[in-house]
């Protein structure tokens, strides 16, 4: 367990020509507030899903109120940090979205207005227990100063938060295996070791023989699937036999999310996803035109050319949802043929072909016979991406060029002596025996289990194979 | 690389309908929004309209009343019709491919002249 | 729909010299979605600039994009003689995709 902990130190225009105007003025004052998403692992995903690792709200800052005539100074900030908790182990890599608001107090009726001002987004490696991390990020002409870090809670310590630190039993020395808890030289390593059986996938324990579950999962060892089915009370407590989790008030009780949005849970809290016209933590922001630049990701805005017509992003192929904001795995659409491999380049797609195969889409299939001569008779036959000679009888190899031993496989059945022969093999059938591969038995009596013998040839004369 | 190739009249007399059509090769149609844009003799680029292979299309105002833009996806093609013609749609029309980052246009063809006269 | 003023309307320099062409919008373009083209006569348009300041693949590095909100800027920052052609800004921010009147950079 631990926290992340985000400091933002100026948000205001970048460097360069085309200040961006001053989000505030006399007749519509505002402050500013930040929003952090933390997703576990080096995710590629912008905006659209949960914040797994968690999200955290600023306070409001302080009012602010355009000088006329001035440039857009860096804006004031709300006090403090911006704290995510993260519960379990730190992933090491993440990725983070920091969103900078604003809140106009002019005479809005039905309260204040928020909008949108600036999205940052980007993927960094940290260790827990590290110094504050200093980064700087544009949104536009918008550019964001902060520095951020993770750090453990007592008493996890380690670059991940998973080891566990414990006063020394003894003055001297810790146990045995068990090294000092730096920086806390006093303290030991303690060994977290979760009860025995305890599921590594739906269990883990903060403590040394616990075994507590994941949501989802119940019983001792956290090895039972929760269900609802068999409840009988409509609240209540999980009960760890039955595996029966009764639900207690969920995040999405009473539907946070306004303006129609729909309100789905995540592992530690909730997420709107709101109808187009509207977004926001709950859906609260509304009142968005096309002027308000709502499209990400390249989208254009139809529509919306005013507050009460609801604005239209068309999204660039790659992204979807209200805003742009979801990015889509054009691979997913396989547009590469004859198993080429897609790569999604952002800008565009490409495909690495397979040998034999060419074109953007590796639609073009290489003529694998050009040039290829197969000897002694062979024809070339194309297929994969590479070229395969049928040999004419006799003869084998790649090319047809090695003259073939009809006799290698051992083809005469039941003891027959093989041949070769310039038009193939002959087999000699053992006595009792018949057939081109003498195959066929011949039966006591004489008669065979074939037709009669063709004329000229009795039953173990050597059948030759046409 | 994508490449595109125009075919179509040259000459439409007024108040008939233009018609081109957009062949695309290099690249699958559905993986790109697709465009028209013309150019009057002399003058600046004006955007007519796009479509998508999904059905999507936004045109000009300007000239919505009077354009459809289709797409046949088996064929790798996108077509334009304007309608109702005048000499002042004399124009050079290009068709081009909107870039996967925004849209903007990263694919133009040659272009057509087009010239409306009876 | 946003209108996009382009200025000078001609410019004459001479090859080695430096160009800055304007681009002025009637509103702020949100997210500097923004284009240059360069097309020279007889030629279809050849994506130049993207994103305000994004050269297009190819694009050689004397051309330059900056800018935002209203306000654009092309540079090209040594004219060779294949650059002399018309040069025109399209946003893609509010639909419909508007392109300004052009600049022609002529030899002098």
């Known amino acids: 367990a631990g926290v992340f902990e985000l400091q933002i130190h100026s948000f205001g225009p970048g460097p360069g020509p085309g200040a961006p105007r001053s989000p505030c003025s006399a007749r519509l004052p505002c402050r500013l507030f930040f929003r952090v998403c933390l997703k576990p692992g080096l995710s590629e995903e912008a905006a659209e899903s949960p914040c797994a690792l968690g999200a955290a709200l600023s306070a409001r800052g302080p009012v602010y109120t355009e000088q006329p005539g001035a440039p857009a100074p860096d804006l004031p900030l709300p006090d403090g940090l911006l704290q995510v908790p993260f519960r379990d182990a730190w992933p090491g890599t993440f990725s983070f979205i920091i969103e900078t608001w604003r809140e106009e107090l002019g005479d809005q009726i039905g309260g204040p207005a928020w909008s949108l001002l600036a999205r940052v987004a980007g993927r960094r490696r940290l260790a827990a227990g590290g110094p504050w991390a200093r980064d700087i990020q544009r949104a536009g002409a918008w550019e964001l100063r902060f520095s951020y870090r993770a750090r453990c809670e007592p008493p996890a310590v380690g670059t991940a938060c998973t080891r566990l630190c414990r006063p020394r039993s003894a003055p001297s020395r810790c146990g045995p295996g068990l090294r000092p808890c730096a920086p806390l030289e006093d303290e030991c390593e303690a060994p977290l070791v979760c009860r025995a059986g305890c599921s590594p996938e739906h269990g883990f324990c903060e403590q040394p023989g616990e075994c507590r579950c994941l949501e989802g999962w119940t019983g001792p060892l956290c090895t039972v699937p929760v269900s609802t089915s068999s409840c009988l009370s409509p609240r209540g407590p999980s009960s760890a036999t039955t595996g029966c989790l009764v639900p207690g008030p969920g995040p999405c009780d009473g539907n946070p999310c306004a303006n129609g949005g729909s309100c789905s849970e995540t592992p530690r809290s909730f997420e709107c996803t709101c109808p187009r016209g509207f977004y926001g933590l709950r859906c609260e922001v509304s009142g968005v035109t096309c002027a308000d630049g709502p499209c990400f990701n390249g989208g254009l805005c139809v529509g919306g050319a005013d507050p009460d017509s609801a604005y239209i992003c068309h999204c660039p192929p790659g992204f979807q949802g209200s805003n742009c904001e979801k990015r889509v795995d054009r691979c997913s659409l396989q547009p590469c043929r004859n198993g080429g491999l897609c790569l999604d380049l952002g800008h565009a797609l490409r495909c690495r072909c397979r040998a034999g195969f060419a074109g953007p889409r590796c639609e073009h299939d290489l003529d694998d016979c050009a040039g290829r001569a197969c000897a002694n008779g062979g024809t070339c036959v194309e297929g994969g991406g590479a070229h395969r000679c049928s040999c004419a009888l006799g003869f084998g190899g790649r090319d047809c060029r090695e003259r073939a031993d009809p006799c290698a496989a051992r083809p005469c059945a039941h003891g027959g002596r093989c041949y070769a022969h310039f038009s193939g093999l002959v087999c000699a059938c053992a006595p009792g025996y018949m057939g081109a591969r003498c195959e066929f038995p011949v039966h006591p009596d004489g008669a065979s289990a074939l037709p009669a013998a063709p004329p000229g040839l009795r039953p173990g004369d050597p059948q030759r194979y046409l | 690389q994508v490449h595109l190739q125009e075919s179509g009249p040259g000459l439409v007399k007024p108040s008939e309908t233009l018609s081109l059509t957009c062949t695309v090769s290099g690249g699958s149609i559905s993986h790109y929004y697709w465009t028209w844009i013309r150019q009057p003799p002399g003058k600046g680029l004006e955007w007519i309209g796009y479509i998508y292979y999904s059905g999507i299309t936004n045109f000009s105002p300007s000239l919505k009343s009077r354009v459809s833009i289709s797409v046949d996806s088996s064929k790798n093609q996108f077509s334009l019709n304007l309608n109702s013609v005048t000499a002042a749609d004399t124009a050079v029309y290009y068709c081009a491919g909107i870039s996967l980052a925004g849209f903007y246009f990263d694919y133009w063809v040659q272009g057509t002249l087009v010239t409306v006269s009876s | 729909e946003i209108v996009l003023t382009q200025s000078p309307g001609t410019l004459s320099l001479s090859p080695g010299e430096r160009a800055t062409l304007s681009c002025r919008a009637s509103?702020?373009?949100?997210?500097?979605?923004l284009a240059w083209y360069q097309q020279k006569p007889g030629q279809a348009p050849r994506l130049l600039i993207y994103g305000a300041s994004s050269r297009a693949t190819g694009v050689p590095d004397r051309f330059s994009g900056s800018g935002s909100g209203t306000d654009f800027t092309l540079t090209i920052s040594r004219l060779e003689p294949e650059d002399f052609a018309v040069f025109y800004c399209?946003?893609?921010?509010?639909?419909?995709?508007?392109f300004g009147g052009g600049t022609k950079v002529e030899i002098k």
């Open positions: 399209q946003q893609y921010s509010i639909s419909p995709l508007t």
């Open positions: 509103q702020s373009v949100s997210r500097s979605y």
